[in-house]
Structures are given as structure tokens and as C-alpha cells.
């Protein structure tokens, strides 16, 4: 179906996707609703997942997921987390949406999640250093396993953006 | 407390060069983006642009590019600006500003350093 | 490039009134937006960021508004020290520009 149908009810919308892949859902209802992700996005539960193949700063990555109407990564499930994991590449880590911008090792999640340290999954010793702020999912090989790391903020990193689902 | 303190006023010739020191005190200075502002006698502020104090990575305005150079010495904590081939029009006060953690808006502020470039 | 348009260039005001300095730019900048202070002869002061958060230290009169493509900083009750030129600056996208200043005088 194409996206420009699915739109004519919904023309006021202000676009940012131009392009949406979508998936129809059984409702009661006899109206059809539409579930879609802007194309080259991952779908998983009801959000959206761009993971970003160019390098930026924490800010500068989260400036990019703001302008596609998405922020960094808020990991609330280790489902969720496991379903990003799958959809990374080994070599490369990834800017996520938790910070800790005053050094105190007070992390704070971008859209006011609260941080909760029994559901956490930093890599063995760390976080490790208070001037490291961000945080990235990255790979180790011994233990083979993906994990969080705090890194320095400037420093380049690829991302993860998500938004929710759109509806049509 | 946080202080970003720069070198004094400069009084040069058009062609020469000039170097502009800021030197951060109060913070971790690998953790915040330096940048440098320009405020022409009687006029508004002007980005130049900013360095990136963990990457070394400069980023310059247009109409900065060229001759105009930011460096760091982090040892030190300390941020340059140099301006080659001084022109008349460089005459103006240039402040150096931390760049903040998340939002980069100029949190704090040098106190400004007075370069006149006359003949 | 995103264009900042600062108005007005100049205001005169009395202590005690309440004034509004407007900042119009080019395109969405989604609230990434600081108003500075500058007294002659010293550095800028950060006022407020995100376009409504008040720096530390700044005083309750002072407010900041808007989102899109329109912003204001609002002064109530106008203090002596108060005057001076104030500059909007988006942190949108780069080059991060200033609007061109308003200078709010003494009547």
C-alpha cells in the first residue's frame, strides 16, 4: 500500500519521513490501522530503531535523532536491548541516550526515564572513569558479550536513534 | 570555581600574527568544546568557531577559514586562538567560551582579549 | 545556514516596566536556543538555555519563551542593572549564530 493513500486522511501531519514501511493491525474496529517505521529503520514492540553508520559526538548524535523526530536509545528491556544487539556491527560502538552530565556518576536517560542501576548492563568494571559521561554498546571479545561503556562525549561514536511507532 | 581566563591586549601591524591564549581552570577540560566569539568596537557578536578539546578536531565559520587557527594545549589546559596575516578588520575584542555538556550553549565566558591591528 | 533575526535593535525603557526582546529565525531550531547579557566593556552572561531555562544565578524576572521558529526573552520589572545588550543564539545546527543584539537603555 502506498504511503501517499495510507496519508489522506492525515494531511496535516508535518513530514519528516517521506517514506514509511508499514504493517496493517487487527482491530476491532472497522477502521484499518496502519503501524509503520520511516524506511531503513528497524522495527521491534512499538518503536523504531535507526542505528547510524556515521560517526559523531554524543550531542552532535543526538541532534541527529532529534531533526528525524527520534532521540538516543532509551534501553528499557533487556529484549529490547537484546534486539539492538543483533542489528549492531562488533567493530563499532554505539552512542546511546544515557548520560552523566555533571561527573557525579548521577546517569540520567534523554527522555527522563529513571535511571535504574538493578537493570543495567555495563561490562565488567565499569563505569570507569567520571570523566567518561556517555555511554556506548560495544563488544568485547573476552568475554564475548555486548555491554555498556562509558566513553569520553566528544569523542566519535556511531548511534542508535528510536522513536514510536507511527500510526496511520 | 569555573574560570576561562585569557591572555591580554595585542597591538599589531596588518600582516603580522597574533596568538590568543584562554586558559580553563574549575573543570575537566577534554569534556567541553572550546569557542571563540568576535565583537568588532560597537558591534554584535560573531562565532568564529570551536575546537573539539577531546579530537583536536577544529570547526571554523566561513568567513573564519583560512587564517584563522585554533590549537590546544591540553597538558595545560589551555586554548588558542592564532590569526596569520593580520587585516585592519580584525581589529575586535575575541572571547574564548566553554561550550556546555549537552546543549553546547556558551556556559561560561574569558574575559575577552582587545586586539587592535593598525599601521 | 539558520538566519537569526533580533528585534528590537534598540529600546528605551524605565525601571520598574516590563519589556520583551524577540528572536525569529529561519528555520525550526526546536528550542536550541540561549539569550546572553553583555554590560559594556564585559564578557556575555548566559541567561537562559533551551530557550526557557534560567541560567544559575539569573533572577526570577527574567523569562524566556517560544519553540519553532519564534522566541522572546521577557524582562519584568526592570532593574538598573538590567541594561546593556542582549543576544539570542541558536544551537541548532552549525554555524551556531547570534541574532544581532538589542541594546535596552535607561529613559
Known amino acids: 500500500q502506498k504511503y501517499s493513500q495510507l496519508l489522506e486522511k492525515k494531511t496535516t501531519k508535518e513530514l519528516v519521513h517521506t517514506t514509511l514501511e508499514c504493517v496493517k493491525k487487527n482491530m476491532p474496529v472497522e477502521e484499518t490501522a496502519w503501524s509503520c517505521c520511516p524506511k531503513n529503520w528497524k522495527s521491534f514492540s512499538s518503536n523504531c530503531y535507526f542505528i547510524s553508520t556515521e560517526s559523531a559526538s554524543w550531542q552532535d548524535s543526538e541532534k541527529d535523532c532529534a531533526r528525524m523526530e527520534a532521540h538516543l536509545l532509551v534501553i528499557n528491556t533487556q529484549e529490547e536491548q537484546d534486539f539492538i544487539f543483533q542489528n549492531l556491527q562488533e567493530e563499532s560502538a554505539y552512542f546511546v541516550g544515557l548520560s552523566d552530565p555533571e561527573g557525579q556518576r548521577h546517569w540520567q536517560w534523554v527522555d527522563q526515564t529513571p535511571y535504574n542501576e538493578s537493570s543495567t548492563f555495563w561490562h565488567p568494571r565499569e563505569p570507569s572513569d567520571p570523566n567518561e559521561r556517555c555511554v556506548v554498546l560495544n563488544f568485547r571479545k573476552s568475554p564475548k558479550r555486548w555491554g555498556w561503556n562509558d566513553v569520553n562525549c566528544l569523542g566519535p561514536q556511531r548511534s542508535v536513534c528510536e522513536m514510536m511507532k507511527i500510526h496511520l | 570555581q569555573i574560570q576561562l581566563v585569557q591572555s591580554g591586549p595585542e597591538l599589531k601591524k596588518p600582516g603580522e600574527t597574533v596568538k590568543i591564549s584562554c586558559k580553563a581552570s574549575?573543570?575537566?577540560?577534554?569534556?567541553?568544546?572550546m569557542n571563540w566569539v568576535k565583537q568588532a568596537p560597537g558591534k554584535g557578536l560573531k562565532w568564529v568557531g570551536w575546537?573539539?578539546?577531546?579530537?583536536?578536531?577544529?570547526t571554523y565559520v566561513d568567513d573564519f577559514k583560512g587564517r584563522f587557527a585554533f590549537s590546544l594545549e591540553t597538558s595545560a589546559s589551555t586554548a588558542y586562538l592564532q590569526i596569520n596575516n593580520l587585516k585592519n578588520e580584525d581589529t575586535a575584542t575575541y572571547f574564548c567560551?566553554?561550550?556546555?555538556?549537552?546543549?553546547?550553549?556558551?556556559?561560561?565566558w574569558g574575559q575577552g582579549t582587545t586586539l587592535t591591528v593598525s599601521s | 545556514d539558520i538566519q537569526m533575526t533580533q528585534s528590537p535593535a534598540s529600546l528605551s525603557a524605565s525601571v520598574g516596566e516590563t519589556v520583551t526582546i524577540t528572536c525569529r529565525t529561519s528555520?525550526?531550531?526546536?528550542?536550541?536556543l540561549a539569550w546572553y547579557q553583555q554590560k559594556q566593556g564585559k564578557s556575555p552572561q548566559l541567561l537562559v538555555y533551551?530557550?526557557?531555562t534560567l541560567a544559575d544565578g539569573v533572577p526570577s524576572r527574567f523569562g524566556g519563551s517560544g519553540s519553532g521558529t519564534q522566541y522572546s526573552l521577557k524582562i519584568n520589572s526592570l532593574q538598573p542593572e538590567d541594561f546593556g545588550n542582549y543576544y539570542c543564539?541558536?544551537?541548532?545546527?552549525?554555524?551556531?549564530?547570534f541574532g544581532g543584539g538589542t541594546k535596552l537603555e535607561i529613559k
Open positions: 533551551n530557550a526557557k
Open positions: 575546537i573539539n578539546t577531546f579530537t583536536g578536531e577544529p
Open positions: 574549575g573543570y575537566t577540560f577534554t569534556n567541553y568544546g
Open positions: 543564539q541558536h544551537f541548532w545546527s552549525s554555524p551556531y549564530t
Open positions: 567560551a566553554r561550550g556546555n555538556f549537552r546543549y553546547y550553549y556558551f556556559d561560561y
Open positions: 528555520g525550526n531550531i526546536r528550542n536550541y
